[in-house]
């Protein structure tokens, strides 16, 4: 029950996160004109990954797409790439996780397959979230650098008395949406990976069977099964797969292939 809840919650959190990453990528307000300590302008500038916009106090808004690819700063291209990679990985992760959900039955899919898919989607969500956080952070760093550069020469003298105001840009709403969304996707991914552990059948869980040969004492050997020191035709340690159920004989549990998360 707890596993199903963890998996379901991880899925929902990741879904919200990826929706947020998509929203942030599409938003125009990655950077907005800094209004602090600036003359009151009747024009407000803001920029996104794909276009820049100008909103006039009259209410008229005009947006222009960046129709050049080569003319754009490398950092902006990198941010675009990170966000797109994040969205693609997240989308694939969502698709995989839908089929991995414990509450959804698809044919005769085994729990081990669901565990694998849950782990895969979890890892995808983690990478997706990290891509979004990295993309937003790179952009934020770019803004901070440019902000202080433009502050240094905020007013550029033009012929003595005439001055031109340098437009400075600060963090836009999309950055905060991106950070939160990336964080949610990351958390969702971690939850999926945790859920995967609960879904994974213990492949090396064996019912301990002891065989008694007359006149010999039974020696208890650690290692998940009891071994006999008796003679006879069946002195081999017999391994019986218990299908995931544990007996009180099992003192030591073995790491399964999903335990490295």
């Amino acid at each position: 029950m707890a596993v199903t809840a963890c998996q379901g919650l991880g899925f929902v959190v990741s879904l919200i996160g990826i929706a947020g990453i998509i929203a942030a990528t599409c938003m125009d307000q990655w950077s907005t004109q800094d209004l602090y300590n600036n003359p009151v302008t009747a024009v407000f500038n803001y920029q996104g990954l794909w276009r820049s916009c100008v909103r006039e106090s009259s209410g008229f808004t005009e947006c222009r797409g960046y129709f050049t690819l080569l003319g754009l700063p490398a950092m902006l291209q990198a941010v675009r790439a990170l966000m797109i990679v994040g969205i693609v990985l997240g989308a694939i992760g969502l698709l995989v996780s839908i089929f991995a959900l414990k509450c959804i039955r698809i044919g005769s899919m085994e729990d081990s397959a669901k565990a694998n898919m849950t782990l895969t989607s979890g890892i995808m969500f983690i990478v997706s979230g990290l891509c979004a956080i990295a993309g937003v952070s790179v952009f934020a760093n770019m803004l901070v650098t440019n902000f202080w550069m433009s502050t240094a020469n905020m007013y550029t003298g033009m012929g003595g008395m005439v001055q031109t105001v340098q437009t400075r840009y600060t963090f836009g709403a999309a950055l905060f949406v991106g950070w939160v969304a990336g964080g949610l996707t990351l958390i969702g991914g971690v939850m999926m990976c945790i859920a995967c552990r609960g879904l994974a059948p213990e492949e090396t869980n064996y019912k301990a069977v002891s065989y008694h040969a007359s006149g010999h004492s039974v020696a208890y050997k650690p290692g998940g099964f009891k071994a006999s020191t008796g003679f006879g035709s069946n002195t081999k340690n017999k391994k019986i797969y218990d299908g995931g159920a544990r007996t009180e004989d099992e003192v030591q549990s073995y790491p399964s292939k999903h335990d490295y998360v």
Partner: antibody
Framework: EVQLVESGGGLVKPGGSLRLSCAAS????????VSWVRQAPGKGLEWVSS????????YYADSVKGRFTISRDNAKNSLYLQMNSLRAEDTAVYYC???????????WGQGTSVTVSS | DIVMTQSPSSLSVSPGERVTISCKSS????????????LAWYQQKPGQPPKLLIY???TRESGVPDRFSGSGSGTDFTLTISSLQAEDVAVYYC?????????FGAGTKLELK
Amino acid sequence: EVQLVESGGGLVKPGGSLRLSCAASGFTFSNSAVSWVRQAPGKGLEWVSSITSGVSYTYYADSVKGRFTISRDNAKNSLYLQMNSLRAEDTAVYYCTRQFKGNALDYWGQGTSVTVSS
Amino acid sequence: DIVMTQSPSSLSVSPGERVTISCKSSQSLLNSGNQKNYLAWYQQKPGQPPKLLIYWASTRESGVPDRFSGSGSGTDFTLTISSLQAEDVAVYYCQNDYFYPLTFGAGTKLELK
């Protein structure tokens, strides 16, 4: 057809108050920024105040700040200018205008005359 | 506040002649976001409210004859009437539309010679 009709002007004593109104029609008033501009007799144009659409930010000329208040009623398609502590230098024709592309004032009313005199 | 300096203050021109009116602002009216200059030109005939001619320094308002044109960038702007008509006799104002307060120039009175 866009129409802006001012009213409320008249003769008032110094220190007195007056409320100008502007009835707008022919365009989506709630989506438009609107302004008041005045012109003293035989003088040039002087921007007085603006109010934006949406959150309704207000802006004032230094000469009227603290004395004049611009407001709007989108339900009535009306713009107002509450003028307090009037001075002789406030005597002018007051125009109601619509701000559009480039923040330019593309439509103007015929104006209402305000005279401040003892 | 932004100071708008118009010149000349008055002008007497013969019909058919080319007219140029200058307007200088104390700060640049160029917005880096869209590379547009926030300056407007108005025409006011006696007894009438002003009429918008040009916005964004060079964009002609609809219905304005093409003999009117605006040019300039940053701080220096010009209104040109390519061939003066009798009905163009008026006072012309430039206005800063970039910074509040939205200041006007003192005006240029255009008369027929």
